[in-house]
């Protein structure tokens, strides 16, 4: 899988989108973890409705919603009043009994409010560093990777 | 018992090269990824590079590229380093460290240290 | 390269002492940064990842904090088992990178 960087603004709502193939998914459940280093175990967030008929309501775990549209086949994960500690590594996932199919991997990376100057010094602005090698700059919420291209595996 | 055991120390004449092993026991090294660091007589900590044993791809700080080279045996699931051109300067304890990469891995493994001495 | 700069590079306390070390990133690095602690003769020790999440057996009495360029360890109630050299390490990018260290002796 390449890794899809989505990057949100410090103290605003970030959406993350996770496409997969509905029929292929039909009637499995979704779910948000969180990766504890690139080769770490993920650690469920967030998961969709029990019922998966239901899978279209927002489910909330603290300030993270994940809502499904089954049909279309979207994913969508809702960050809310993002924070520094929520950037890192997280998967989309496909729930079918107790094993878990990867969807998307994603990075969240944490932006300056260019608004908020008290606190400019502590987070990045887009432009003055890079967690990727070779990485191309969009100016869009997401950017994915090149073929074979992999985060550097970074510090603990 | 997770734990990474590193060979014995070793003393080489300057231009010689050294190859220092780090095996693992307790866990599979394709799960991790294995870095090298060294630290002189008193001195801080300096990152060498890292292998994904999995992968087979390795990665080197600028200051050591082209005279260290890091490979790994995931039958016998060992790291290996190897510093060539050796000077005075080399002489050091090397440490392998073994983690889940960056972002936020919660595991941190350390060898016991190999202290490698070039000397004339 | 991204540089890191520890200061001070000793302090000595004394045992129940409150401890703070601080470490300067030249770059931005996010949260992607660790404090290891080191005694002599032994390989280091992770004590705090993702700049202030606490590693599994290490004492409560550590805690760390900061995001972007600067950051901080802090040692509530310094314990005689404490009396070691402790080093920031940034995870942003490679080559991974060491502060200089800070050694932490006996008043």
């Known amino acids: 899988h390449n890794t899809t960087v989505f990057q949100g603004v410090a103290g605003q709502s970030l959406q993350v989108s996770c496409p997969y193939d509905s029929m292929k998914h039909w009637g499995r459940r979704k779910a948000w973890c969180r990766q504890l280093g690139e080769k770490g175990p993920c650690q469920r967030v967030v998961s969709t409705h029990n019922l998966w008929l239901l899978s279209f309501l927002r489910r909330w775990n603290g300030s993270t919603a994940i809502t499904d549209d089954t049909l279309g086949g979207t994913l969508t994960i809702t960050l809310r009043n993002l924070q520094p500690h929520d950037a890192g590594l997280y998967q989309c996932q496909s729930l079918h009994g107790s094993e878990a199919d990867t969807l998307r991997k994603v990075l969240v990376e944490v932006l300056a409010d260019p608004l908020d100057h008290r606190d400019a010094g502590d987070l990045w602005f887009p432009g003055e560093s890079e967690s990727f090698e070779d990485a191309h700059v969009e100016h869009s919420i997401s950017r994915s990777l090149l073929e074979g291209e992999i985060p550097f595996p970074p510090t603990s | 018992q997770v734990q990474l055991v590193q060979s014995g120390a070793e003393v080489k004449k300057p231009g010689a090269s050294v190859k220092v092993s780090c095996k693992a026991s307790?866990?599979?090294?394709?799960?991790?990824?294995i870095h090298w660091v060294r630290q002189a007589p008193g001195q801080g900590l300096e990152w060498m590079g890292w292998i994904d044993p999995e992968q087979g791809e390795s990665k080197y700080a600028p200051k050591f590229q082209g005279r260290v080279t890091i490979t790994a045996d995931t039958s016998t699931s060992t790291a290996y380093m190897e510093l060539s051109s050796l000077r005075s300067e080399d002489t050091a304890v090397y440490y392998c460290?073994?983690?889940?990469?960056?972002?936020?891995?919660?595991?941190?493994?350390w060898g016991q240290g190999t202290l490698v001495t070039v000397s004339s | 390269d991204i540089q890191m700069t520890q200061s001070p590079s000793s302090l000595s306390a004394s045992v129940g002492d409150r401890v703070t070390i601080t470490c300067h990133a030249s770059?931005?690095?996010?949260?992607?940064l660790s404090w290891y602690q080191q005694k002599p003769g032994k390989a280091p020790k992770l004590l705090i990842y993702?700049?202030?999440n606490l590693h599994t057996g290490v004492p409560s009495r550590f805690s760390g904090s900061g995001s972007g360029t600067d950051f901080t360890l802090t040692i509530s109630s310094l314990q005689p088992e404490d009396f070691a050299t402790y080093y920031c390490?940034?995870?942003?990018?490679?080559?991974?990178?060491f502060g200089q260290g800070t050694k932490v002796e006996i008043k």
């Open positions: 307790g866990f599979s090294i394709e799960d991790f990824y």
């Open positions: 770059q931005h690095i996010n949260v992607w």
């Open positions: 993702k700049a202030s």
């Open positions: 390490q940034q995870g942003q990018t490679y080559p991974r990178t």
């Open positions: 460290h073994a983690d889940h990469g960056n972002y936020g891995s919660t595991m941190d493994y």
